[in-house]
């Protein structure tokens, strides 16, 4: 799955929480990728879209259904986490059960925690229903731990 980037021109700040040394995120559809000069926090997010039905098209990235849903979800996340420290999302997967969406969100390290990731997504559910016709339920967010996590450093004010 291609990575969707939050395109912005701010320097990555040093911070605390999960730290992983990763290369810059890249994307085929964004001309500017943020340079990740320090750490990134990753969060695994899953939710149900209860007004859609899963079918085999969502197993094939070349289908219109897959591409349209992926585009709407990517757009929605760019709206919810409006840049600042949001670096993008990746690994969107669709599963049966109405439609279950699973993905990974990347944020500038130390700028957000798991509770606020979930809170802001939940706050946006009503707007998602009206703007994208997606009825969202069963939201679950968790930290993505990295075994190669570096020592946490003090956060540069955001």
């Amino acid at each position: 799955t291609p990575t969707t980037l939050a395109s912005h021109s701010t320097k990555t700040d040093a911070s605390s929480t999960h730290h992983s040394s990763v290369p810059p995120l890249t994307s085929s559809n964004h001309s500017t990728s943020p340079q990740l000069s320090t750490g990134v926090s990753f969060f695994f997010l899953s939710f149900h879209i209860s007004n859609l039905q899963f079918n085999s098209s969502l197993e094939d990235p070349s289908t219109d259904y897959y591409q349209e849903l992926q585009r709407d979800i990517s757009e929605m996340f760019l709206q919810i986490y409006k840049q600042g420290g949001f670096l993008g999302l990746s690994n969107i997967k669709f599963r049966p059960g109405s439609v279950v969406v699973q993905l990974t969100l990347a944020f500038r390290e130390g700028t957000i925690n798991v509770h606020d990731v979930e809170t802001q997504f939940n706050q946006y559910k009503t707007e998602a229903a009206s703007r994208y016709n997606l009825t969202i339920s069963d939201v679950s967010v968790s930290d993505v731990p990295f075994p190669f996590s570096a020592q946490s450093g003090a956060g540069v004010p955001g």
Partner: antibody, heavy 119, light 107 residues
């Protein structure tokens, strides 16, 4: 470095309006939420609302909705807060403060603007 | 709306003393609490984010802990420059809210 510089103190009559500015520098203005916080004399801090200059998206504390308008001018990297139908209770210091997200913490603050509402 | 209650409202302290502030949320907010210091006629200054995460430039004598509904800010060895009012703020729900503050004064 990041700087938020607010306009000077204002004295206003009840029923009038006031527009406070917060001029920023040292970061990409469009990419961060700008929040406004009120502090009445001798009182605590109260969140008024926020604007995302990139697209003008706003969120308001219900307590202030209808009496406060937040705007942003990307060309000058300046955020504005307009208070209308002023009452004496609006006498306070108003701060602008930058955040990463809709719900977040505030690492950078303006110096504050005192608005006095008096007849 | 999440109500944050700080205690005490006022605290009389002496230099080198260990000082503890508490902030209680009206419902569980995970670790979405942030602490600020405000001196008279100044803007608030961020001390701790997400309950316990340190901020560069803030002296190491300031630390935070807690999760759910009960949070603590500690100054390990108070210095005279720490005399100020301290506020907690939550980012777990709209509207964003602050505690009423705890004011430190010298004994």
């Amino acid at each position: 470095q990041v700087q938020l510089v607010q306009s000077g103190a204002e004295v206003k009559k009840p029923g009038s309006s006031v527009k406070i500015s917060c001029k920023t520098s040292g970061y990409a203005f469009s990419n961060f939420w700008m929040n406004w916080v009120r502090q009445a004399p001798g009182q605590g801090l109260e969140w008024i609302g926020q604007i995302y200059p990139g697209d003008g998206d706003t969120n308001y504390n219900a307590k202030f909705k209808g009496r406060v308008t937040l705007t942003a001018d990307k060309s000058t990297s300046t955020a504005y807060m307009e208070l209308s139908s002023l009452r004496s209770e609006a006498t306070a210091v108003y701060f602008c403060a930058r955040s990463y997200y809709r719900s977040a913490w505030f690492a950078y603050w303006g110096q504050g603007t005192l608005v006095t509402v008096s007849s | 709306e999440i109500l944050l209650t700080q205690s005490p409202d006022f605290q009389s302290v002496t230099p080198k003393e260990k000082v503890t502030f508490t902030c209680r949320a009206s419902q569980s907010i995970g670790t979405s609490i942030h602490w600020y210091q405000q001196k008279p006629n100044q803007s608030p200054k961020l001390l701790i984010k997400y309950a316990s995460e340190s901020i560069s430039g803030v002296p190491s004598r300031f630390s935070g802990s807690g999760s759910g509904t009960d949070f603590t800010l500690t100054i390990n060895s108070l210095e005279s420059e720490d005399i100020a009012t301290y506020y907690c703020q939550q980012s777990n729900n709209w509207p964003l809210t602050f505690g009423q503050g705890t004011k430190l004064e010298i004994k």
